[in-house]
């Protein structure tokens, strides 16, 4: 006789990943009685709300029921009605929140009150909508990448089942870029972390790890080039900025007021004579570089050794994950490839930006051209910010993996905070126990 | 730019029904979003209903089961059919474009109709 299928007995949880440009909800999935065991959740649905992040709501918060209603849709849709009780919903908000919240923690609250008044009318678990930190967002990263590598099974395998394996127990570095923040975690070797607030000490899986983690905000992409452009406005003849970080031919005029708005450039802020300015792109990779390393404060550092701003960063140890916007853009610009030198990237970079904006808007015609008009700056600014931001050089650059998934789950910090929220992450490593009954059917 | 014009207002009596139009010069498609409005006099301006590119719906507390937005993505043109009307309703109704994602997180820009007068008067 055919053995019949006995139910799936499965769990679902779902994470909302509340950035500055956009909101991303993802679908996880696991084994009910393999909770505690490791690399056993996995993604099985990621939506991207469209639209802004929740942060540019702040006028408009009776519109973010509506924008959050698809994406939770698809959750009512692809999640068992039958577990739709008992299917936790946590909102992790990020640097475009925490920028907001600088301005007016009042504002910040109501916009949180009404995006948890939108997701308690659903009929999941709603467990909450908060602000999580820089540091958690940089330890969630780290934890998710390493938990999808298998880094924490205490089972050594003679055979590779997960990309990037190197079949070593060391963990992965994670590097994380959004739109306002960016993130730099790993476990330095042998290394006193030198200042506090970098430190951190997990106990998982009967193992200790001490771990680094900085989060930089404004030095996300997006809020990146918004000091950048209010930096070198300062010292603009007239209302044409002339920007080497945009094709040559492209233009786009910026009003003062949105330059102003976000708290990243209130240190290059001034009165200018004049209301609106015009960019006009030139395209040229050198200069783009030298003018995003204005950012950077290299010159002072009350450590053994710094980042830039001031911020402590131990020698730079093992491999890396590089993930988010990391990942997004140089996968556009088709450089995510192991074999891609540091060199050639640059030199890719130089022929790219140096391409005419007519010419680009051709060769990638499905592309937006809000997107496309990116690409030049963000891609600079990756290789900016890893090399004379992180300290990565031309030899160590091998050991940055650009990566989107690891085995069907993207990489981000919203894995790692389900895993914590949900208690799937043991501190000791559990007993091995007999196979269940229903590993026999 | 998307220009959107507002039509079907007009007088009606305590549990009558009107139907709104609001017709884009282009695609809806380009909104993630379009919704229905209402300020009355004295008033701020309140969210009715709006329907997302992915048809769902959403309806503020005091119109549910009265009022039902729908959408024509052929004819570019967003609906709302209103029953049951009551004196509270009167308002000039507005048409709105909830816009997609813009330039390094720049705000995005309010598409809005010019509004049409509903007046729910015996």
């Known amino acids: 006789t055919q053995n019949k299928a006995l139910p799936e007995n499965v769990k679902y949880g779902i994470v909302l990943d509340a950035g500055s440009s956009h909101t991303s909800l993802y679908i996880y999935k696991w084994p009910a009685e393999k909770e505690n065991d490791t690399g056993v959740v996995h993604q099985v649905e990621e939506c991207r709300v469209k639209g802004p992040g929740i942060s540019k709501f702040v006028q408009k918060v009776n519109e973010i029921g509506i924008y959050l209603t698809d994406c939770m849709e698809r959750a009512r849709e692809v999640i068992p009605r039958s577990q739709h009780q008992e299917t936790p919903v946590y909102l992790g908000a990020t640097a475009g929140m925490r920028l907001l919240r600088m301005e007016s923690e009042e504002l910040a609250d109501r916009v949180l009150d009404v995006v948890e008044r939108s997701l308690s009318n659903y009929p999941f678990d709603f467990q909450g909508a908060r602000i999580i930190t820089g540091q958690e967002e940089g330890a969630y990263g780290w934890i998710t990448i390493n938990y999808l590598l298998g880094k924490f099974s205490q089972k050594t395998r003679w055979f590779s089942i997960v990309p990037y394996e190197t079949n070593n127990q060391e963990t992965f570095g994670a590097l994380d870029l959004g739109g306002a923040s960016t993130q730099v975690t790993f476990v330095p070797q042998n290394q006193t972390i030198e200042s506090p607030d970098n430190a951190l000490q997990f106990r998982l899986y009967g193992k200790d790890y001490n771990v680094y983690t900085h989060s930089f905000l404004c030095y996300g992409k997006d809020q990146a080039l918004w000091q950048k452009l209010a930096k070198d406005i300062q010292v603009a003849s007239n209302e044409i900025l002339r920007d080497p970080c945009f094709h040559p031919g492209y233009k786009k005029v910026v009003n003062v007021s949105d330059l102003y708005k976000t708290p990243c450039t209130k240190r290059f802020e001034m009165t200018l004579p004049f209301q609106q300015f015009e960019i006009q792109g030139i395209g040229n990779y050198q200069q783009c570089h030298q003018s995003i390393l204005e950012l950077f404060n290299t010159s002072y550092c009350p450590y053994s050794q710094c980042a830039f701003n001031g911020i402590f960063l131990p020698p730079l140890q093992g491999d890396f994950g590089a993930f988010s916007a990391f990942y997004f853009v140089m996968k556009f610009l088709n450089l995510t490839s192991e074999k891609v030198s540091q060199e050639k990237v640059t030199e890719m970079m130089k022929k790219f930006c140096a391409q005419p904006w007519e010419e680009i808007k051709t060769s990638y015609a499905g592309v937006k051209e809000k997107y496309l008009s990116e690409y030049c700056f963000s891609g600079t600014y990756i290789l900016s910010l890893l090399l004379q931001g992180y300290h990565f050089t031309a030899d160590s650059w091998e050991h940055i993996h650009f990566i989107g998934k690891i085995q069907g789950s993207d990489a981000g910090w919203t894995l790692g905070y389900m895993l914590n929220l949900t208690n799937m992450i043991p501190a000791e490593q559990p007993l091995s126990t007999p196979l269940s009954h229903s590993t026999y059917v | 730019q998307v220009q959107l014009v507002e039509s079907g207002g007009g007088l009606v009596q305590p549990g009558g029904s009107l139907r709104l139009s609001c017709a884009a010069s282009?695609?809806?498609?380009?909104?993630?979003?379009m919704g229905w409005y209402r300020q009355a006099p004295g008033k701020q301006r309140e969210l009715v209903a709006a329907?997302?590119?992915?048809?769902?719906?959403n309806y503020a507390d005091s119109v549910k089961g009265r009022f039902a937005i729908s959408r024509d993505n052929a004819k570019n043109t967003v609906y709302l059919q209103m029953s049951s009307l009551k004196p509270e309703d009167t308002a000039v109704y507005y048409c709105?474009?909830?816009?997609?994602?813009?330039?390094?997180?720049?705000?995005?820009?309010?598409?809005w109709g010019q509004g049409t007068q509903v007046t729910v008067s015996s």
């Open positions: 282009g695609s809806i498609f380009s909104f993630n979003a």
């Open positions: 709105k474009g909830i816009g997609g994602s813009t330039w390094f997180g720049e705000d995005e820009p309010d598409y």
């Open positions: 329907i997302t590119s992915g048809g769902n719906t």
